[in-house]
Amino acid sequence: CDLPQTHSLRNRRALILLAQMGRISPFSCLKDRHEFRFPEEEFDGHQFQKTQAISVLHEMIQQTFNLFSTEDSSAAWEQSLLEKFSTELYQQLNDLEACVIQEVGVEETPLMNEDFILAVRKYFQRITLYLMEKKYSPCAWEVVRAEIMRSFSFSTNLKKGLRRKD
């Protein structure tokens, strides 16, 4: 499964699209900043097995896809960029799923690290709660957009796990 190159390319494209989606300058939204506590320490201190890395990356992308597929998200972003971004995420999910099948076989279930999956879910719950509290304001979405860009760039350690042969 030659995922690292494909995934990095798609990840880069998704990041560019996410950057282009911005509507207000972050300079105008400094007061709305929020610490979402991306679980980078947990990821950094862990040597991921290939299947674990895939499942955690899958969860991150799935949660991002869900977040940007809501009605509130549709109202916040320019439609064509949002569609391109969602397509890029969908393709990444497909790539990861194909890789799982290749890595562990169709019959087997990948070794899921529940703690890491849970940490990712809680992180996205905090993001969703923040958006709700801020009533999905333009600046709240800007804060979230910047945060997702950061989390995408933080997932490098997970990609290192994808390069290793188990």
Partner: antibody, heavy 121, light 107 residues
Framework: QVQLVQSGAEVKKPGSSVKVSCKAS????????ISWVRQAPGQGLEWMGG????????NYAQKFQGRVTITADESTSTAYMELSSLRSEDTAVYYC??????????????WGQGTLVTVSS | DIQMTQSPSSLSASVGDRVTITCRAS??????LNWYQQKPGKAPKLLIY???SLQSGVPSRFSGSGSGTDFTLTISSLQPEDFATYYC?????????FGQGTKVEIK
């Protein structure tokens, strides 16, 4: 590593304009913010405004609104600061400063070497 | 605009001394405060961000504390290379504003 290289010193007449450039290397130019900060001789630091190249539009401090224009050229990874209607009190060292990638533009992580602009008749 | 006031404006100290610089904001800025060091003829250098986080590569003798309106930069044991001017900067809202600076001189 990250580097910001600014254009050379300028001597200008009152009423004229000056355009200072800041060429960046390291990181993805379009996705981080660049601010301009000035320092008059023997004085403190003053934020003039900033830009995130991918947005195109800049934010300015009220004090400089209408007199300063901050732009960015993604093709050359260069940011520019143009100050018009120069007066003697605009004599200062002008710094470009880079904020962290994918982060809110709150702290100045990297600085250019500074450009001295002298306004004198 | 948020005004930042530093004190003292200058101080004299000896190598090995513990030095404390304070910074006060005209309104609450949470923990959105950064500290910079500037040497003559050089660009400022980030030391502390978000009130108390040490910037990578900065010696541990530098520390920051405070939240709301009152903040402190402490140099636990002053070294010869620490003689410089120090600035605080708020990043709570635009315009981003700096304190007037504190010059640390050799006694």
């Amino acid at each position: 590593q990250v580097q910001l290289v600014q254009s050379g010193a300028e001597v200008k007449k009152p009423g004229s304009s000056v355009k200072v450039s800041c060429k960046a290397s390291g990181g993805t130019f379009s996705s981080y913010a660049i601010s301009w900060v000035r320092q008059a001789p023997g004085q403190g630091l003053e934020w003039m405004g900033g830009i995130i190249p991918i947005f195109g539009t800049a934010n300015y401090a009220q004090k400089f609104q209408g007199r300063v224009t901050i732009t960015a050229d993604e093709s050359t990874s260069t940011a520019y600061m143009e100050l018009s209607s120069l007066r003697s009190e605009d004599t200062a060292v002008y710094y470009c400063a880079r904020h962290l990638e994918y982060a809110f533009p709150d702290k100045f992580d990297y600085w250019g070497q500074g450009t001295l602009v002298t306004v004198s008749s | 605009d948020i005004q930042m006031t530093q004190s003292p404006s200058s101080l004299s100290a000896s190598v090995g001394d513990r030095v404390t610089i304070t910074c006060r904001a005209s309104q609450s800025i949470s923990s959105y405060l950064n500290w910079y060091q500037q040497k003559p003829g050089k660009a400022p250098k980030l030391l502390i961000y978000f009130a108390s986080s040490l910037q990578s590569g900065v010696p541990s003798r530098f520390s920051g504390s405070g939240s709301g309106t009152d903040f402190t930069l402490t140099i636990s044991s002053l070294q010869p290379e620490d003689f410089a001017t120090y600035y605080c900067q708020q990043s709570y809202s635009t315009p981003l504003t700096f304190g007037q600076g504190t010059k640390v001189e050799i006694k």
